[in-house]
Interface confidence: low
C-alpha cells in the first residue's frame, strides 16, 4: 500500500517531519533509513531505521484524585523491517501500571457554628454598616474540605448622630509688597500672605476640627535686582599625567572661574578653562598581527594511495595562512594557522555538463578607455557525482562534510559552436569621462 514519506523522524515526540510526498511504497521510502512514513495522514509515524523501543511515555494522571488509585504509561516498538527486543513487531504497545496517590485522604465538608453578635457600627455618626461572623467548626472540615456559604454577613446601621463639620482653608490672599528693594542688604527681603478658615468654618455643635496648619506664610522675595559680580580665574592646576603608554598623547591643565565666582548675572571669566600640551612617551605602540588570506587548498589525497581522482573515496587536503605585521609585543593572531577538510578529488574527471543560464552582465571594460563593452557568459557546468556529502573518517569523531575539489572536464553538447563557454558582448552607452574627484573640487 502507498504511504506518506517524510525526511525526518523526531525521536522526542515520535512525529514525522518534512513531508516528501505520498503514493510511494514503504520499501522505496525506507531506502533511506533516516526517513519515516505514515500509512495515512495523522496516523502513527514509523521511522525507517531498524525497530527499537521508544522512550516510556510520561505517567498518565492518577485514576482518582484522592486516596489510592493507579496510573498507566506505555512505550511503542518503532521502526521498519525487523523486530524489537522480545520479538515484538513494529507498532506494538507495551504498558506499565503502577499504584498512585495524589492525596492520602478525600476532602470532607464541615458545618457552621451559630452566628456571633453584631459588631459596633462602622461609623460614629450618620449611617454605616455592621458585621457579624460564624466559625467553620461544627464539625471542622477534614482533608482540605470547607463549609458551604459565607463566614460573615453585613447590614446597614444608623447611629442617629449628626456628624460635625470640620474646618477647611479658603484660598490664600495676595502677597504683601516686599520688605526691601534689593538682595544683599542687612535684612533678607520677604513677602507675606494670609488665609481664612472659612471654607467651611468648623461647626460648634457637635464641635468640628479647626483648620490644620498656619494662617500666614512668608517667602524670600524674588525678581529683585541683584548687584552683579564678575568672575575671576583661579590658578592653573597641575599638569595631568600623559594618558598613553606608547606614542604621543595629550596632557591637560585646568583652572576654575572661582576667584571670585560670578554672581547676580555678573560675566563669566574670559578665556579657556583648559589648555593642552603634547606628551611623547618615545615608546612605539604594539602592532597586532593580522592573518593573511588563506592559501590555496593542497591537492586532495589519501595516504598510501597514489590517486583517488574520479572515485568515491574521500581524501584530505589542507591550506595555511601567515600571521603578518606583529611588532612591539602586539597580540598574536587568534585562531588556527592550518585548515584541514575532507574532499573528493574530481581532478581531470570527465563529467557530464549542462549549460548554465546567462550570467548577469559584467562591468564595462575598459572603464576609461575607448568603446567600452560589457559581456555575459553561459558556462558548461559539470554535474557533480552524487557521492555522500558527509563521511565518518575515524570512529567516535562524528560525521564530516566532504567537498569536491579539482579540475574536472565538463562535457556539454556544442552551443553556438562552443564546448565550454559562450560569451555575448554589448557596447556600453552614454559613457561619462573618468575624472579625479579631488581635482574637480579645486
Amino acid at each position: 500500500d502507498p504511504v506518506l514519506c517524510f525526511t525526518q523522524y523526531e525521536e522526542s515526540s515520535g512525529k514525522c517531519k518534512g513531508l516528501l510526498g505520498g503514493g510511494v511504497s514503504v520499501e522505496d521510502c525506507c531506502l533511506n533509513t533516516a526517513f519515516a512514513y505514515q500509512k495515512r495522514s495523522g496516523g502513527l509515524c514509523q521511522p525507517c531505521r531498524s525497530p527499537r523501543w521508544s522512550l516510556w511515555s510520561t505517567w498518565a494522571p492518577c485514576s482518582v484524585t484522592c486516596s489510592e488509585g493507579s496510573q498507566l504509561r506505555y512505550r511503542r516498538c518503532v521502526g521498519w523491517n525487523g523486530q524489537c527486543s522480545g520479538k515484538v513487531a513494529p507498532g506494538t504497545l507495551e504498558w506499565q501500571l503502577q499504584a498512585c496517590e495524589d492525596q492520602q485522604c478525600c476532602p470532607e465538608m464541615g458545618g457552621w457554628s451559630g452566628w456571633g453578635p453584631w459588631e459596633p457600627c462602622s461609623v460614629t455618626c450618620s449611617k454605616g454598616t455592621r458585621t457579624r461572623r460564624r466559625a467553620c467548626n461544627h464539625p471542622a472540615p477534614k482533608c482540605g474540605g470547607h463549609c458551604p456559604g459565607q463566614a460573615q454577613e453585613s447590614e446597614a446601621c444608623d447611629t442617629q448622630q449628626v456628624c460635625p463639620t470640620h474646618g477647611a482653608w479658603a484660598t490664600w490672599g495676595p502677597w504683601t509688597p516686599c520688605s526691601a528693594s534689593c538682595h544683599g542688604g542687612p535684612h533678607e527681603p520677604k513677602e507675606t500672605r494670609s488665609r481664612k478658615c472659612s471654607a467651611p468654618e468648623p461647626s460648634q455643635k457637635p464641635p468640628g476640627k479647626p483648620c490644620p496648619g498656619l494662617a500666614y506664610e512668608q517667602r524670600r522675595c524674588t525678581g529683585l535686582p541683584p548687584c552683579p559680580v564678575a568672575g575671576g580665574w583661579g590658578p592653573w592646576g597641575p599638569v595631568s599625567p600623559c594618558p598613553v603608554t606608547c606614542g604621543l598623547g595629550q596632557t591637560m591643565e585646568q583652572r576654575t572661574c572661582n576667584h571670585p565666582v560670578p554672581q547676580h548675572g555678573g560675566p563669566f571669566c574670559a578665556g579657556d578653562a583648559t589648555r593642552t600640551h603634547i606628551c611623547n612617551t618615545a615608546v612605539p605602540c604594539p602592532v597586532d598581527g593580522e592573518w593573511d588570506s588563506w592559501g590555496e587548498w593542497s591537492p586532495c589525497i589519501r595516504r598510501n594511495m597514489k590517486s583517488i581522482s574520479c572515485q568515491e573515496i574521500p581524501g584530505q587536503q589542507s591550506r595555511g595562512r601567515t600571521c603578518r605585521g606583529r611588532k612591539f609585543d602586539g597580540h598574536r593572531c587568534a585562531g588556527q594557522q592550518q585548515d584541514i577538510r575532507h574532499c573528493y578529488s574530481i581532478q581531470h574527471c570527465p563529467l557530464k555538463g549542462s549549460w548554465s543560464e546567462w550570467s548577469t552582465w559584467g562591468l564595462c571594460m575598459p572603464p576609461c578607455g575607448p568603446n567600452p563593452t560589457r559581456a555575459r557568459q553561459r558556462l558548461c557546468t559539470p554535474l557533480l557525482p552524487k557521492y555522500p556529502p558527509t563521511v565518518s573518517m575515524v570512529e567516535g569523531q562524528g560525521e564530516k562534510n566532504v567537498t569536491f575539489w579539482g579540475r574536472p572536464l565538463p562535457r556539454c553538447e556544442e552551443l553556438q559552436g562552443q564546448k565550454l563557454v559562450v560569451e555575448e558582448k554589448r557596447p556600453c552607452l552614454h559613457v561619462p569621462a573618468c575624472k579625479d574627484p579631488e581635482e574637480e573640487e579645486l
Epitope: 590555496e296 558556462l379 557546468t381 557533480l384 579540475r407 574536472p408
Partner: nanobody
C-alpha cells in the same frame, strides 16, 4: 573577454633550450589552473604540463625531468622552461587558463606558438 597570449616559440637544435611565456588578461577573476598543451601535425592535442594556483604540478611522462612549469598567480602568468629538446617536441604549443568552482567553469585558449626542434 579574456585574452590568453603566448610568446617565446622558435627554432632550436636537438639538446637546446627554450622558454615559453603566457599571460591571461581581461575580464578575469581567479584562475584556478594554467597549462601548456601541444599539437603536432596530424596528431591530437595533448597536455604537456599543468600548474594549480597553489603550485601543484602535473607533467606528461614524455617531458618529465626536462620541462619545468611555473606561474605568478597574482599576474595570471605561466612559464614553461624546456631543456634537452628532442625532435618529437616539435609542435604548436597552446596556453590554457581555467577558471573553475563548484558551480561551473570556463576555459580559455591562446592562439598558439610554434616550436621547431631540428636535428
Amino acid at each position: 573577454q579574456v585574452q590568453v597570449v603566448e610568446s617565446g616559440g622558435g627554432l632550436r637544435q636537438t639538446g637546446g633550450s627554450l622558454r615559453l611565456s603566457c599571460t591571461a588578461s581581461g575580464r578575469i577573476f581567479e584562475v584556478n589552473m594554467m597549462a601548456w598543451y601541444r599539437q603536432a601535425p596530424g596528431k591530437q592535442r595533448e597536455l604537456v604540463a599543468e600548474i594549480s594556483r597553489v603550485g601543484t604540478t602535473v607533467y606528461a611522462d614524455s617531458v618529465k625531468g626536462r620541462f619545468t612549469i611555473s606561474r605568478d598567480s597574482a599576474k595570471n602568468t605561466v612559464t614553461l622552461q624546456m631543456n634537452s629538446l628532442k625532435s618529437e617536441d616539435t609542435a604548436v604549443y597552446y596556453c590554457n587558463a581555467l577558471q573553475y568552482d563548484r558551480y561551473g567553469g570556463a576555459e580559455y585558449w591562446g592562439q598558439g606558438t610554434q616550436v621547431t626542434v631540428s636535428s
